[in-house]
């Protein structure tokens, strides 16, 4: 008799794939454009990334540091009208992309939360949650919660409103903090909150430290759903050298939880390579004409157009990983087991019941390494086979689909491998 199948966990839409942040509509669209109507025209691109949700804005009216001239119910006319927003929502729904609205109040000002008028602002947020839920948004984001007085209490209240409307609605809180104590304290008192933080950006880009941060976080949060990113808003290139971008994409897509990216992460968008562009929101490089300021500054391989035509590009890797993440049970909701593979390496297994299993091996170092996979660290339910098929490598040159002997696994500098192997009873 075949063994009983493990009961599938209840999965919300944000469990099924990545979220994509567009914090600055103008920078995302470029060419002096940057409104909701223009964004609607980019939804096909978002579909091609296989992302499940779009975190948008803030787009509400906000006169810098003026609480009286901040209206969370009104869209800033520079971005469009309520009708444009409704139209965007409808189009996004048709493409199965959920829309999360950022309601960080004073996004143009010094202090995101008008620290001297917290109660006034909190009331505005409450009204806005109810208004935009009725309008059909799928969730909300609020950032810089480290500056929000009594954040935990307010978030609990806002979570109640959001979940009270529908269990299918999401509240995301963002912080620049990387303090695990504060993170865990907030998560303990706000059960279904999704939190983005700078926790992982402290990793110092080493395998041992990253492994330690990830496992510490997962052990501490237990079986609650979490999200993975390097910050609440910034690009991966703000924290990582170019040679580690592929490795981090592979890791973020294969850890248990929701990966959260900022627009441009999929192409390695780097403000430092675009003179005069703001670090927090550089112009998106759709093609070579997206940054006309300095002729020749942008080459084809830095753009969406150029990378779309190159199967070995970062964008192509992002699309493949996003696709795998959204359809493989072991990556959707599988168990996670990290184990030793040698200095500089971080390796783990994702597995769910009798479904295909995945092995991830990441070499954070700048020298090639032989992986000494310590299978003895793993529980019996997650044992390693002698060979596994190479699904993809972050570096070109490997033959995909070929079986690799796990005892003789060698990784190039900064290489990450995603291998698959079948369940064996």
């Amino acid at each position: 008799r075949a063994p009983r199948c493990r009961e599938l966990p209840a999965q919300k839409w944000w469990h099924t794939g990545a979220l994509y942040r567009i914090g600055d509509l103008q920078a995302f669209q470029g060419h002096g454009a940057g409104n909701l109507a223009g964004l609607k025209g980019r939804l096909d691109y978002l579909s091609s990334l296989k992302v499940k949700g779009l975190v948008l804005g803030p787009i509400h009216k906000n006169q810098k540091d003026d609480v009286a001239q901040t209206d969370l119910l009104q869209i800033d006319p520079n971005f469009g009208s309520k009708e444009d927003f409704d139209s965007l929502l409808q189009s996004a729904k048709k493409k199965s992309i959920r829309v999360i609205l950022d309601l960080t109040p004073n996004y143009r000002g010094e202090n995101s939360w008008f620290s001297t008028q917290v109660d006034t602002v909190a009331t505005k947020v409450k009204d806005a949650l109810e208004f935009w839920l009725q309008a059909g948004v799928d969730g909300f984001q609020v950032r810089d919660i480290e500056n929000l007085k009594d954040a935990s209490s307010f978030l609990a209240e806002w979570q109640n409103i959001t979940k009270g409307f529908s269990e299918d609605r999401l509240l995301i809180a963002g912080t620049n903090s990387s303090d695990l104590q504060q993170i865990l304290s907030l998560l303990e008192s706000n059960k279904d909150l999704l939190l983005t933080s700078s926790y992982l950006s402290d990793s110092g880009s080493t395998g041992e430290h990253t492994k330690s941060l990830v496992t510490q976080y997962l052990n501490a949060t237990g079986n609650r759903w979490c999200s993975w990113s390097l910050s609440q808003a910034r690009l991966l290139t703000s924290f990582l050298p170019a040679q580690l971008l592929r490795l981090y994409q592979l890791m973020l897509f294969t850890l248990p939880g929701t990966p959260v990216f900022s627009y441009g992460d999929e192409i390695g968008l780097d403000a430092a390579a675009l003179p005069g562009q703001p670090m927090e929101a550089p112009v998106m490089l759709w093609d070579e004409s997206s940054f006309p300021d300095i002729p020749g500054a942008v080459s084809a391989n830095m753009t969406v157009k150029g990378q779309s035509e190159d199967p070995g590009s970062l964008l192509s890797l992002f699309r493949r990983l996003s696709d795998q993440r959204s359809k493989e049970r072991s990556l959707l909701h599988g168990d996670f087991h990290a184990f030793s593979a040698g200095p500089g390496l971080f390796s783990y297994i994702r597995h769910w019941d009798q479904n295909e299993r995945f092995l991830v091996v990441l070499n954070f170092g700048d020298v090639g390494l032989s992986a000494g996979l310590q299978a003895s660290d793993l529980p019996a339910s997650a044992s390693l086979p002698a060979k596994a098929d190479l699904l993809l490598s972050t570096q070109p040159g490997r033959e995909e689909g070929s079986p690799l002997e796990l005892e003789r696994l060698k990784l190039e500098p900064h290489e990450g491998l995603l291998l698959r192997f079948p369940y064996a009873a």
């Epitope: 954040a151 209490s153 104590q181 907030l186 303990e188």
Partner: antibody
């Protein structure tokens, strides 16, 4: 109004033990991390312990690790500090304080309770 | 551990004066600093959190500034109730650490 009231301080011999308490009111106790901070007779401030809102995670400086235990009873709105294997350098005024939690960073303090370690 | 060097350790000023107290951290603390007030024989009161944010009920003559490793607390138009001890605290990294304190006395 937020109120924190410590109790339990006493004169204890070196090597002895004691349990300090802090009764909280005026806020949703279970939503906040809580900490103990001490002030030495020379008026120097030292962080002693922190516990997360649900009580699952605790943090200590090396100077008290293994000797002090922080706990909480959210149903009773009470924070505790169990101190043991006491040394003379533990002599101080012990304060209970709210935070650090996001947006709340040691914002409210109790009036303190005195612990004297002496033979 | 992060060392918080607070200066001056004591100062005297007159009513109506503006004074500044500084704290230097031994490494960058990304605005994860608070300022506390302790009146003689009393407990502590939070004044400023995250470098610049005023705690509830704190008069606007108190302000905080700084970035990286250097921060300051400024009190403008000193009033009689402001003469007290002031401490900075960093909560960027464990163990949380405090400055040595500044005693502000009336001239």
């Amino acid at each position: 109004d937020v109120k924190l009231v410590e109790s339990g301080g006493d004169l204890v011999k070196p090597g002895g033990s004691l349990k300090l308490s802090c009764a909280a009111s005026g806020f949703t106790f279970s939503s906040y991390s809580m900490s103990w901070v001490r002030q030495t007779p020379e008026k120097r401030l030292e962080w002693v312990a922190t516990i997360t809102s649900g009580g699952s995670y605790t943090y200590f400086p090396d100077s008290v690790k293994g000797r002090f235990t922080i706990s909480r009873d959210n149903a009773k709105n009470t924070l505790y500090l169990q101190v043991s294997n006491l040394k003379s350098e533990d002599t101080a005024m012990y304060y209970c304080t709210r935070g650090p939690s996001f947006g709340n960073y040691l914002d409210y303090w109790g009036q303190g309770t005195t612990l004297t370690v002496s033979s | 551990d992060i060392l918080m060097t607070q200066s001056p350790s004591s100062m005297s000023a007159s009513l109506g004066d503006t004074v500044s107290i500084t704290c230097h951290a031994s490494q960058g603390i990304s605005s994860n600093i608070g300022w506390l007030q302790q009146k003689p024989g009393k407990s502590f009161k939070g004044l400023i959190y995250r470098g610049t944010n005023l705690e509830d009920g704190v008069p606007s003559r108190f302000s905080g500034s700084g970035s990286g490793a250097d921060y300051s607390l400024t009190i403008s138009s000193l009033e009689s109730e402001d003469f007290a001890d002031y401490y900075c605290v960093q909560y960027a990294h464990f163990p949380y650490t405090f400055g040595g304190g500044t005693k502000l006395e009336i001239k």
